[in-house]
């Protein structure tokens, strides 16, 4: 008879997740050389560690905490771009312009970019069947909260002048319920991040709006400016000659507004 | 029955070396982190060092980087703790204590063996 | 200095119940562990994880974690708990780091 599984609303850990993980682990410290010292198959144990025999409504950041320990790496504080609603552009971003880093570039969010994954409680199963949605079952799963602790640590760590890039054509351009507006927001250090540079990414050709004035960005403004951090904002009306132009930053087109 | 046994402590001039050891029994050993924690005389305890299951990553209290190294043999079940440049106020008590599931806790300590520093 | 702040002493009769104060801001996102220790003898493990026991010790001894502060509760005291007792967690780099330690005396 086999044993009843609990069936939960989302997708179920991505298939060959294991190997995935290693596999991304060796390949980025492989690339990276001041993280060669990092032994994966010990970051795969604490990885597995947080989520393997645990109920996946009741994971913690003290879970991930091994991991994190594990996966310590000190990107230039002043060189962070966060992202909201606007992923694969501000990755193509940070592949043209290498000194910056999304949280995606660095090993911690590199292994878990794109991946699903939860296990069973008191088994060492991990479920391929589905894991816990973060509206129909609960937010604290394996997935919800691994990124809310790496964005966490993320955002502590920057200072100077940290930039976010936001999504022009969603409804809400800042959604406070987003990982940016939920965590990332909250947990810049007044006393050394001096200010938050949002860049706002048009997506229709001929808009030509001044998105710095719509209302979400001005309730970002103000949650940053009671934080006591400073605030300016950029239309970037043509993300794609945006790109073009920190490509080759020299071409005579890049001068005007982009 | 699980058990942790201390050695090496001893009396030993400022600047001086001295390296304890740490013999484990009744658990697997290379399944799990280990420290060295101190407490000297009349104070609390403070912790000095980790070590990865696999031995590949150690991390250090600041007031002993640079001169102490912790490093352990699998294959011998026993953890050590290389202590260089030795001061006065390393004068201590120290455990070795075998880490639960990496931070859950210390769930099993050493006696403990006594390092002076003193001319 | 120690990141996780507890009282020097406590104190309370036979039968009584005490609580043992932790605080730090590390403690939010980390687990937080308990130890006894009798005196001239190595600490003792009495409550990890937060709030679970280890098997073997008594249910007398129970804890507790809201946000950046714990607290560890003795009931039914008893005169061989008179002891020193320690919090620790992981600190911000995430590294172990214990609280001052609690003297108790059982009066």
């Known amino acids: 008879v086999p044993r009843w599984r609990q069936q939960w609303s989302g997708p179920g850990t991505t298939k060959r997740f294991p190997e995935t993980v290693l596999a991304r682990c060796v390949k980025y410290t492989e690339i990276h050389p001041e993280m060669r010292h990092v032994d994966c198959q010990s970051v795969w144990d604490a990885f597995k560690g947080a989520f393997i025999s645990k109920h996946p409504c009741n994971i913690t950041e003290e879970d991930y905490q091994p991991l994190m320990k594990l996966g310590t790496q000190t990107v230039p504080c002043n060189k962070i771009l966060l992202w909201s609603r606007i992923k694969d552009l501000a990755h193509q971003f940070t592949q043209v312009q290498r000194d910056m880093f999304t949280l995606e570039d660095t090993l911690l969010g590199y292994l878990a970019d794109d991946l699903t994954w939860c296990g069973e409680f008191n088994t060492s199963k991990i479920n391929y069947q589905s894991c816990p949605d973060w509206r129909k079952d609960c937010s604290n799963n394996p997935v919800s909260v691994f990124w809310k602790t790496v964005s966490r640590r993320f955002a502590e760590a920057a200072c100077d002048v940290v930039h976010v890039m936001l999504n022009g054509s969603r409804s809400k351009i800042f959604d406070k319920n987003s990982t940016f507006g939920s965590v990332e927001v909250h947990n810049l250090q007044p006393e050394k991040v001096q200010t938050l540079e949002a860049w706002v990414i048009h997506g229709g050709r001929e808009d030509s709006r001044d998105l710095c004035q719509d209302p979400t960005i001005k309730e970002l403004e103000s949650i940053i400016s009671k934080r006591n951090i400073q605030f300016s904002c950029k239309n970037i009306y043509r993300p794609d000659k945006f790109l073009q132009c920190v490509k080759n930053p020299e071409d005579s087109s890049c001068t005007s507004e982009i | 029955e699980v058990q942790l046994l201390e050695s090496g402590g001893d009396l030993v001039q400022p600047g001086g070396s001295l390296r304890l050891s740490c013999g484990a029994s009744g658990f697997t050993f290379s399944d799990h982190y280990m420290s060295w924690v101190r407490q000297a005389p009349g104070k609390g305890l403070e912790w000095v060092a980790d070590i990865s299951a696999r031995g590949s990553n150690t991390w250090y209290a600041d007031s002993v980087k640079g001169r102490f190294t912790i490093s352990r043999d699998n294959s011998e079940n026993t953890l050590y703790l290389q202590m260089n440049s030795l001061r006065a106020e390393d004068t201590a008590v120290y455990y070795c204590a075998k880490n639960w599931n990496y931070n859950y806790g210390m769930d099993v300590w050493g006696h403990g063996t006594t390092v002076t520093v003193s001319s | 200095q120690s990141v996780l702040t507890q009282a020097p002493s406590a104190s309370g009769t036979p039968g009584q119940r005490v609580t043992i104060s932790c605080s730090g801001s590390?403690?939010?996102?980390?687990?937080v562990s308990w130890y006894q220790q009798l005196p001239g003898t190595a600490p003792k493990l009495l409550i990890y994880?937060?709030?679970e026991r280890p098997s073997g010790v008594p249910d007398r001894f129970s804890a507790s974690k809201s946000g950046t502060s714990a607290s560890l509760a003795i009931s039914g005291l008893q005169s061989e708990d008179e002891a020193d007792y320690y919090c620790a967690s992981w600190d911000d780099s995430l590294n172990w780091v214990f609280g001052g330690g609690t003297k108790l005396t059982v009066l």
């Open positions: 994880r937060n709030f």
């Open positions: 590390s403690i939010q996102n980390n687990y």
